[in-house]
């Protein structure tokens, strides 16, 4: 009689994570008497996957009824496959012996590769806000995919970015892989409504890439521009001075009026006007009683935006019978009309 052969017909199989893997194995003879066992890997460190007679293998079921007389099919099904199950599986025939069973013959092995989807890409930006014209870095991470081949692209408002670096880890063989990419983005004043997108394409996604996004509104700080103007006289001895705070983001803003360097009033921005580009405008005014001042008055509008150092703009108010246009921003005098606020 011909010597028993262990036949594993499949050289390799590929299974999606979460599915079941069927590993085929048949023997050509019932002799010698002894059990079949399945292992992952070869050599002394091999891992026992299934022993038909003892042990606990809750994820493994046999394809055919091993108890049937003259059964020669020892195929198994492993449920709920994960990337950790990847490897080469051997169907091994043992011969009964004393004290232990003796390995008689092994199949050629079946390599199981596991297709695992990448996790949803997570995009994170810088910890601190940055202002327009500055370059900021965004990172994108995705984990747990297999095989290793993967494509990552960066976009800003639909336009593909080219300044980025990507690494896939580990470099060698692994059950699953991670991708890490860093893109550099130059901020502009119009970026409050902008989005940075990281797009990951992988064989498991069937042409439907995964995307992670970051809103530049969480990254950008647009500092305000200030304009101080003198409004027409309301009453004979009163002057209305306005401070226009324009095109700033985010909203957090505190304004302080100083008269000759002394704090007159502090207020926190509210009822803001939003511009189309997502920035905000705000206006504050100060009513100055000219008759209370013997000398010229230096009015300063001081703005602290988003916790940054204060910026200010001053206006010199002449206290005279016929005041002329004065000030560092050449605001109109009390008798002249000013431009309407935004």
């Amino acid at each position: 009689e011909e010597e028993l052969q262990v036949i594993q017909p499949d050289k390799s199989i590929s299974v999606a994570a979460g599915e079941s893997a069927t590993l085929h194995c048949t023997v050509t003879s019932l002799i010698p008497v002894g059990p079949i066992q399945w292992f992952r890997g070869a050599g002394p460190g091999r891992e026992l996957i299934y022993n038909q007679k003892e042990g606990h293998f809750p994820r493994v079921t046999t394809v055919s009824d091993l108890t049937k007389r003259n059964n020669m099919d020892f195929s198994i099904r492993i449920s709920n496959i994960t990337p950790a199950d990847a490897g080469t599986y051997y169907c091994v025939k043992f011969r009964k012996g004393s004290p232990d069973h003796v390995e008689f013959k092994s199949g050629a092995g079946t390599e199981l590769s596991v297709r695992a989807k990448p996790s949803a890409p997570v995009v994170s930006g810088p910890a601190a806000r940055a202002t327009p014209q500055h370059t900021v870095s965004f990172t994108c991470e995705s984990h747990g995919f297999s095989p290793r081949d993967i494509t990552l692209k960066w976009f800003k408002n639909g336009n593909e970015l080219s300044d980025f670096q990507t690494n896939v880890d580990p470099a060698g063989d692994s059950v699953s892989y991670s991708i890490h990419s860093t893109a550099k983005v130059v901020l502009t004043r119009e970026d409050v409504h902008s989005q940075v997108i990281c797009e990951v394409a992988h064989v498991t996604l069937q042409g439907d890439p995964l995307r992670g996004t970051a809103n530049l509104s969480e990254t950008i700080r647009v500092p305000p521009t200030l304009e101080v103007t003198q409004q027409p006289v309301r009453a004979e001895n009163q002057v209305n001075v306005t401070c226009q705070v324009r095109k700033f983001y985010p909203q957090r803003l505190q304004l302080t009026w100083l008269e000759n360097g002394n704090v007159s009033r502090t207020e926190t921005a509210s009822t803001l006007t939003e511009n189309k580009d997502g920035t905000y405008n705000w206006m504050s005014w100060l009513l100055v009683n000219v008759s209370a001042h013997r000398d010229d008055v230096k009015l300063t509008c001081q703005v602290e935006h988003d916790g940054q150092p204060a910026v200010s703009k001053s206006h010199d108010l002449k206290v005279s019978a016929h005041p002329k246009e004065q000030g560092s921003n050449t605001a109109p005098g009390p008798a002249l009309a000013s431009a309407a606020p935004l």
Epitope: V33, G45, E47, L48, K53, E54, G55, H56, K96, D100
Partner: antibody, heavy 113, light 108 residues
């Protein structure tokens, strides 16, 4: 559902023999090795041996060679452990188990004059 | 034969405490063949961890197993009252199969 029902407690005299049974339900004992384990009061577990009910092949721990005999009857789906020449050292709970995963409730054997 | 030595023989732990039980083998045991059983007084042993690190059905996730070669351990990340029991390691890598002497784990 896998169940292993062991025979009741035994009080036996020194020098006598006793045969314990372990009847399986929910599976066929022919498909698994059936093991027997000894546990003395407040002590550890000792592997006695096992049987392959399919062909009657047995393995024993050296300590229990000659003391224990494991048999099986596939028609009644039952495994047996026979202990001979009993001494007080054999007073213990004896467990059967299926392939190391499922255990019977145990049988207390007390050897006393 | 492979001798399994468990330590400590007896230990007590407070609720919430991390507990590690060790099992040392006199010669190398393949991790696939190292099992742990839990036993409570008056009950049969229950398979608790199989193939070194896999939790049997119904075992809380606070339990974990690790090791290779001659050194294995069972860890409870945060002790609970219901974990008070005896724990036995077991090898079936080669005949005769053997058990460790057990660790009796008590709650403080």
């Amino acid at each position: 559902e896998v169940q292993l029902q062991q025979s009741g407690a035994e009080l036996v005299k020194p020098g006598a023999s006793v045969k314990l049974s372990c009847t399986a339900s929910g599976f066929n004992i022919k498909d698994y090795y059936m093991h027997w384990v000894k546990q003395r009061t407040e002590q550890g577990l000792e592997w006695i041996g096992r049987i392959d009910p399919e062909d009657g092949e047995t393995k024993y721990a050296p300590k229990f060679q000659g003391k224990a005999t494991i048999t099986a009857d596939t028609s009644s789906n039952t495994a047996y452990l026979q202990l001979s020449s009993l001494t007080s050292e054999d007073t213990a709970v004896y467990y059967c188990d299926r392939g190391l995963a499922y255990w019977g409730q145990g049988t207390l054997v007390t050897v006393s004059a | 034969q492979i001798v399994l030595t468990q330590s400590p023989a007896i230990m007590s732990a407070s609720p919430g405490e991390k507990v590690t039980l060790t099992c040392s083998a006199s010669s190398s045991v393949s991790s696939s063949y190292l099992y742990w059983y839990q036993q409570k007084p008056g009950s049969s042993p229950k398979l608790w961890i199989y193939s070194t690190s896999n939790l049997a059905s119904g075992v809380p996730a606070r339990f974990s197993g690790s090791g290779s070669g001659t050194s294995y351990s069972l860890t409870i990340s945060s002790m609970e009252a219901e974990d008070a029991a005896s724990y036995f390691c077991h090898q079936w890598s080669s005949y005769p199969y053997t058990f460790g002497g057990g660790t009796k784990l008590e709650i403080k």
